[in-house]
């Protein structure tokens, strides 16, 4: 997330400037904290204070976005239901599975569907 | 495996604009970062630009801010680079690259366009 | 921007040989250094990406090391098709920058 900005090396924040290009946000040292991003536009140059969270599980952060399906349906058994994403964009140095699988708990309803069926699949 | 093919050779007088088109076949042409690249004769390589085919984000150098357009056509999978007003200097091979930071990259084969009047 | 400098501009070396390529960028650029293989009339070829993180159908014998400022790529025992030209990359920060190659040629 971009903090205050650090320091501007040419040109000022009031210069007109139609689009900026950042770069990733770099840490300082290491590979995760407090770092800076470089931005360009024309001959004006900035740096803006970021950070990198340490804890980020870099899969399902910001760096990839994915497109997902609909959720499947429940699954009496394990009381969960899964959908799948492929891979929409990733930023340029963030290493994105390119498909994921998500699953989370049914609500109780669905639980309850599910389970019917089952039984009546029984019979 | 993605597969680049770009188009022909092209000779231009200086001042025409030229396209450059980079046709993607095999994975997910929309999921990557399509980078632009050229080598002048006998020397080494120069990035241009970049664009994400999913939105059309484009960074570009700013050396090709007035020189280079890029574009994209998600229903055909084909990456375009435009050229405006060339020059001699811009004689060169240019080359598109589909990039993963997962797996690498792929590249065209170059395209040759040649500015001389 | 971010300048590579790559050293030597020609390596003379017979095959069996190691290769050691040096590229070193003017401020620290964590991982984000690649390093291609270029060939007369060829597009380059991505040997490593992220500084030591090997690509899938590239012989074992390349290898590279950092982060930082200073990268190496090394071959370990040079074979008669490595003779080429070799570029570093870096992808830390916008624009995307070359360094100027490196010949390896056979002496």
């Known amino acids: 997330v971009a903090k205050k900005k650090d320091k501007v090396k040419k040109g000022g924040p009031g210069s007109e400037c139609a689009e900026w290009a950042w770069g990733p946000c770099t840490p300082s040292s290491k590979d995760c904290g407090v770092g800076f991003r470089e931005g360009t536009c024309g001959a004006q140059t900035q740096r803006i204070r970021c950070r990198v969270p340490c804890n980020w599980k870099k899969e399902f952060g910001a760096d990839c976005k994915y497109k997902f399906e609909n959720w499947g349906a429940c699954d009496g058994g394990t009381g969960t239901k899964v959908r799948q994403g492929t891979l929409k964009k990733a930023r340029y140095n963030a290493q994105c599975q390119e498909t994921i699988r998500v699953t989370k708990p049914c609500t109780p309803k669905t639980k309850a569907k599910a389970k019917a069926k089952k039984g009546k699949g029984k019979d | 495996q993605v597969q680049l093919v770009q188009s022909g050779a092209e000779v231009k007088k200086p001042g025409h604009s030229v396209k450059v088109s980079c046709k993607a076949s095999?994975?997910?042409?929309?999921?990557?970062?399509m980078n632009w690249v050229r080598q002048a004769p006998g020397q080494g390589l120069e990035w241009i630009g970049m664009?994400?085919?999913?939105?059309?984000?484009?960074i570009l150098n700013q050396k090709f801010k007035d020189k280079a357009t890029l574009t994209v056509d998600i229903s055909t999978s084909t990456a375009y680079m435009e050229l405006s007003s060339p020059r001699s200097e811009d004689t060169a091979v240019y080359y598109c690259?589909?990039?993963?930071?997962?797996?690498?990259?792929?590249w065209g084969q170059g395209t040759l366009v040649t500015v001389s009047s | 921007e971010i300048v590579l400098t790559q050293s030597p501009a020609t390596l003379s070396l017979s095959p069996g040989e190691r290769a050691t390529l040096s590229c070193r960028a003017s401020?620290?650029?964590?991982?984000?250094l690649h390093w291609y293989q270029q060939k007369p009339g060829q597009a380059p070829r991505l040997l490593i990406k992220?500084?030591?993180q090997s690509i899938s159908g590239i012989p074992a014998r390349f290898s590279g090391s950092g982060p930082g400022t200073d990268f190496t790529l090394t071959i370990s025992s040079v074979e008669p098709e490595d003779f080429a030209v070799y570029y570093c990359?870096?992808?830390?920060?916008?624009?995307?920058?070359f360094g100027g190659g490196t010949k390896l040629e056979i002496k």
């Open positions: 992220y500084a030591s």
């Open positions: 401020e620290s650029i964590s991982n984000n």
């Open positions: 664009i994400h085919p999913s939105d059309s984000e484009t």
């Open positions: 095999g994975q997910s042409f929309s999921s990557y970062w």
């Open positions: 990359q870096q992808s830390n920060s916008w624009p995307l920058t």
């Open positions: 690259s589909s990039w993963s930071a997962k797996r690498g990259d792929f």
